[in-house]
Interface confidence: low
């Protein structure tokens, strides 16, 4: 049973509470929502920096590009863009910087042409596992998404739940195998400490993967083997210390790959020998001549390409009886 939507005017919070609006009848095809700018010729609607607290209900049916940036949406409920008739043309949706802290299951359902989605710069404390798949079935209908931009969606430390942020994001990416057609995935600036091992294997169509400006320490358990279409892999500004043989071999085996590794704290000891040898031979690393050692102190700022095996030693580990204080 259903009941009339009630007023939420007595609510207050740092992010406004949303009650979905009731749309009595379909919008006129040429109608432009209040606080938005519309161009039918460009099939574009812009509702930018307007402090909107909900998605306008009267979006024109022609909209192909929708910008809802710089608002205060707080919550995207299920079917937030479901309309009668549906927004069948909507292909690019930008919701960046709109203070979203929750994206619910099925938030993007009924958008059959949605190819690009940008949720960047929203503190997503609660991203439903079924935000993109819209279904809790083990195999969902394929999503039309080709590009998914999720840069800087990590919430402040005090708003994070007692669960892995990485795990929450990956669960949404993998649910129902709906994103098999995804070609571009951007996850920059999210404080990721690790990459769950199954994520890449289940996104086989990826061409571009951006993991820059995270806190990744190691890629030891990450497999790139199945990403045969991968063209760019951005790993700049992480906490990588060394790439091991298995990773090097997998990257070298990808036919179209370009890897970006700048600004990582490379540890130039005996474990770095394989990576240095590989760097000298490979064509896949962009700007490889800029990669420098961060540790140990005696190696700081040395260029990796200029190192030889004699430079890459590991201090012997002394037995406790011989250690001095």
């Amino acid at each position: 049973s259903s009941s009339p939507t009630s007023s939420a005017s007595s609510f207050s919070s740092s992010a406004p509470f949303l009650a979905s609006a009731v749309s009595a009848q379909p919008p006129l095809p040429d109608q432009c929502p209040a606080l938005c700018e519309c161009s039918e010729a460009a099939r574009t609607v812009k509702c930018v920096n307007r402090n909107l607290t909900e998605v306008p209900t009267d979006l024109p049916a022609y909209v192909r590009n929708l910008f809802l940036t710089g608002n205060q949406l707080a919550v995207l409920p299920a079917g937030a863009f479901a309309r009668r008739p549906p927004l069948a043309e909507l292909a690019a949706l930008n919701l960046s910087g709109s203070r979203l802290d929750e994206v619910r299951a099925g938030a993007f359902e009924h958008l059959p042409s949605l190819r690009q989605l940008d949720l960047s710069h929203n503190p997503l404390a609660d991203l439903s596992p079924f935000a993109f798949s819209g279904s809790n079935a083990s195999v969902s209908a394929p999503s039309p998404l080709v590009e998914l931009i999720l840069n800087h969606i990590v919430p402040p430390e005090d708003e994070r739940q007692n669960r892995s942020f990485e795990g929450m994001v990956v669960a949404a990416l993998l649910a129902g195998r709906a994103l098999q057609g995804l070609r571009r995935l951007e996850l920059a600036s999210n404080h990721f400490l690790y990459l769950p091992r199954d994520v890449l294997a289940q996104l086989p169509s990826l061409r571009h993967l951006d993991l820059s400006n995270n806190s990744l320490v190691s890629l030891t358990y990450v497999s790139f083997r199945n990403l045969t279409h991968l063209e760019s892999l951005h790993l700049e500004d992480n906490a990588l210390k060394v790439l091991h043989n298995g990773t090097l071999a997998e990257l070298q085996g990808l036919p179209h790959i370009r890897v970006f590794l700048d600004n990582n704290p490379w540890v130039c000891d005996c474990h770095m020998a394989d990576m240095v040898t590989w760097l000298k031979e490979t064509e896949v690393v962009q700007g490889k001549d800029r990669l420098t050692c961060a540790y140990p102190e005696k190696m700081r700022n040395r260029v990796l390409l200029e190192l030889n095996s004699a430079d890459l030693d590991c201090d012997p580990i002394l037995p406790p009886s011989l250690q001095t204080s």
Epitope: A21, S23, P77, A82, D126, P129, N136
Partner: nanobody, 120 residues
């Protein structure tokens, strides 16, 4: 079939406490935000509190902030409303709500409600 069953209502004196429960079935409870509404006689139904899917974020009506606490147990498919320092103006029928889709398409679901009476 979606079902929401509220319990825990009753008569309580001003300043007293009650804990309402809402048992959910027929949908993947952990994937949806849940809310409590209330409706006093002759008044419009109003939002009281809501909680996000994993309980990481809660929101409250101004009139109940600091007195009411919403929580959920996804293992038990249950959402709770702890009501302290109750006032006569809290008297109403309290409804549990699950918004499984757009309200405009009739995809939100309600329980039958449980009556809370605050009176000396």
């Amino acid at each position: 079939q979606v079902q929401l069953v509220e319990s825990g209502g009753g008569l309580v004196q001003p300043g007293g406490s009650l804990r309402l429960s809402c048992a959910a079935s027929g949908f993947t409870f952990s994937s949806y935000a849940m809310s409590w509404y209330r409706q006093a006689p002759g008044e419009e139904r109003e939002l009281v509190a809501s909680i996000t899917t994993a309980g990481g974020s809660t929101r409250y009506a101004d009139s109940v902030k600091g007195r009411f606490t919403i929580s959920r147990d996804n293992a038990k498919n249950t959402v709770y409303l702890q009501m302290n320092s109750l006032k006569p103006e809290d008297t109403a029928v309290y409804y549990c709500n699950a918004e499984l889709g757009p309200r405009r398409l009739g995809m939100d679901y309600w329980g039958e409600g449980t009556l809370v009476t605050v009176s000396a």
